[in-house]
């Protein structure tokens, strides 16, 4: 049917656009941007996610945020919206837009997202200098239905608040040196 054919061609166009971007082909980013702009659907939103990741990798954070906001407008799928909003909040924290990040996180509903939202909320609050708020967010996250790894990480962040947190970089270096 026409519907099946158009879905198949949209899927193929999406695959082509995203594969070209991930392989770093010349002119692939403008082509993917065009695809995302023209496809106001799940494929467009997924293309925006991939593009945003490329922009983050190139440290073009403003572009990444704009692309993610475009992706949000393109889909009605709640889970996909949650993933996009999480990425957006991370980028906003990096852009020192903590209040915007907190607003973004407030839009993510559903028990399944509670722990990862709590982790990011803590990071956003800490970036504003609100240590007590960060502690409360992480404590709530630890109590939620959370994977052991994420729970442990948030507990470590709580502990670090009281001992003058070593930088995330140093934590990562320590981890890698013992791998």
């Amino acid at each position: 049917s026409h519907q099946v054919d158009s879905a198949r061609s949209a899927s193929l166009a999406y695959q082509n656009a995203v594969t070209a971007v991930s392989e770093g082909k010349p002119d692939s980013i403008p082509a993917a941007e065009k695809f995302a702009a023209e496809n106001k659907n799940t494929y467009g939103a997924l293309a925006s996610l991939e593009l945003a990741q490329q922009f983050v990798d190139k440290n073009e954070l403003e572009k990444a945020a704009a692309q993610l906001q475009q992706g949000l407008a393109d889909t009605s799928d709640e889970n996909l919206k949650a993933v996009i909003n999480l990425r957006l909040a991370r980028v906003q924290v990096q852009l020192k837009q903590a209040d915007a990040a907190l607003k973004t996180l407030d839009t993510i509903k559903g028990e399944g997202w509670a722990a990862i939202v709590a982790d990011l909320r803590g990071e956003a609050l800490l970036s504003k200098g609100d240590k007590q708020g960060a502690r409360s967010a992480w404590e709530a996250g630890v109590k939620s239905d959370v994977t052991p790894a994420l729970s442990e990480m948030m507990q470590m962040k709580i502990n670090n608040l009281s001992i003058g947190s070593p930088s995330r970089l140093e934590e990562e270096l320590r981890r890698r040196l013992t791998e």
Epitope: Q94, E170, E172
Partner: nanobody, 122 residues
Framework: EVQLQESGGGLVQPGGSLRLSCTAS???????????MGWYRQAPGEERVMVAA???????MYRESVQGRFTVTRDFTNKMVSLQMDNLKPEDTAVYYC?????????????WGQGTQVTVSS
Amino acid sequence: EVQLQESGGGLVQPGGSLRLSCTASGVTISALNAMAMGWYRQAPGEERVMVAAVSSRGNAMYRESVQGRFTVTRDFTNKMVSLQMDNLKPEDTAVYYCHVLEDRVDSFHDYWGQGTQVTVSS
């Protein structure tokens, strides 16, 4: 985009010393100074592992197996990192890679040099 150029590998006898150096380009001093700089190594048939690093705060950190034998130093003003390797052992034989680690909040980003061969053999 950070580019890394190593120098100083070679062949050395067990118990000997070597010094590796690495200079970064394509990045401002202030941007690089917010990143960690250090060294990884990859022995034949093994995974690449971090050996030593200097954080953005200037703290030197080491893998346990090289502690006391290797010294990592970082020159923040000249975008350089060096690895002084003393009392070398045959198991230190590997390709050594200069490495920069950037914290991008939602992920860590790695930059690598081309690698320089260190062979410890009598």
